[in-house]
Amino acid sequence: CKAMHVAQPAVVLASSRGIASFVCEYASPGKATEVRVTVLRQADSQVTEVCAATYMMGNELTFLDDSICTGTSSGNQVNLTIQGLRAMDTGLYICKVELMYPPPYYLGIGNGTQIYVIDPEPCPDSDF
């Protein structure tokens, strides 16, 4: 197993609709054809998997149907979008990239993107 550099933004603010997007870029040392991308969340001294997708270079990322993540790939960049976020989901979201094929296997872990989620204030009742 070999190490690989992964870059991602330090901070992202989710939209009022609970959607956050960021780019995960990896420095591929070779010509990988199969790549696995995993988004992890670190909070309260625990790391949990948010979503994961394996894709063939040049093809679209495919997350599970019930995943809160969507994404697109372009070269060594993956554009990730996480939806359905609430204030309680604020935390450090880490991009993990694995070059699965061909060998050798490479593993890269980003420094994490702190995603801040602010629940929208409910609209006040109006007489109009």
């Epitope: 670190q42 001294s45 625990q46 790391v47 949990t48 450090l92 593993l107 872990i109 420094n111 994490g112």
Partner: nanobody
């Protein structure tokens, strides 16, 4: 809250083997840096081995190199210390320790640890 629980200690003859386990309750050890320390009677606590959060890096004290092997099984939420060719001087209480570092340090061992288990006694004697 995560707690660490050691097991696998006991009495073994010189030259024998033991495998210590460090299991987590109340959470997972995924990506945690885990260390094994030991303390013999009348001696200072010393770090024996550690494994990084990714499992890619392992370190060993000179006194156990080539005899001890640390590994992790995330599916079992457990870190192991395989101890071979045990000597009388390996007799001690062995402690499992852990810390979840920033992701930029997941490939490294921690310099200090937040969490400590209660320890398990290892006695090497004929």
């Amino acid at each position: 809250e995560v707690q660490l629980v050691e097991s696998g200690g006991g009495l073994v003859q010189p030259g024998g083997s033991l495998r210590l386990s460090c299991a987590a309750s109340g959470g997972t050890l995924d990506y945690w840096s885990i260390g094994w320390f030991r303390q013999a009677p009348g001696k200072e606590r010393e770090e024996v081995s550690c494994i990084s959060g990714t499992g890619l890096r392992t370190n060993y004290a000179d006194s156990v190199k080539g005899r001890f092997t640390i590994s992790r099984d995330n599916s079992k939420n457990t870190v192991y210390l395989q101890m071979n060719s045990l000597r009388a001087e390996d007799t001690a209480v062995y402690y499992c320790t852990g810390k979840l570092l920033h992701p930029s340090l997941w490939s490294a061992c921690a310099n200090e640890y937040d969490l400590w288990g209660q320890g398990t006694q290892v006695t090497v004697s004929s």
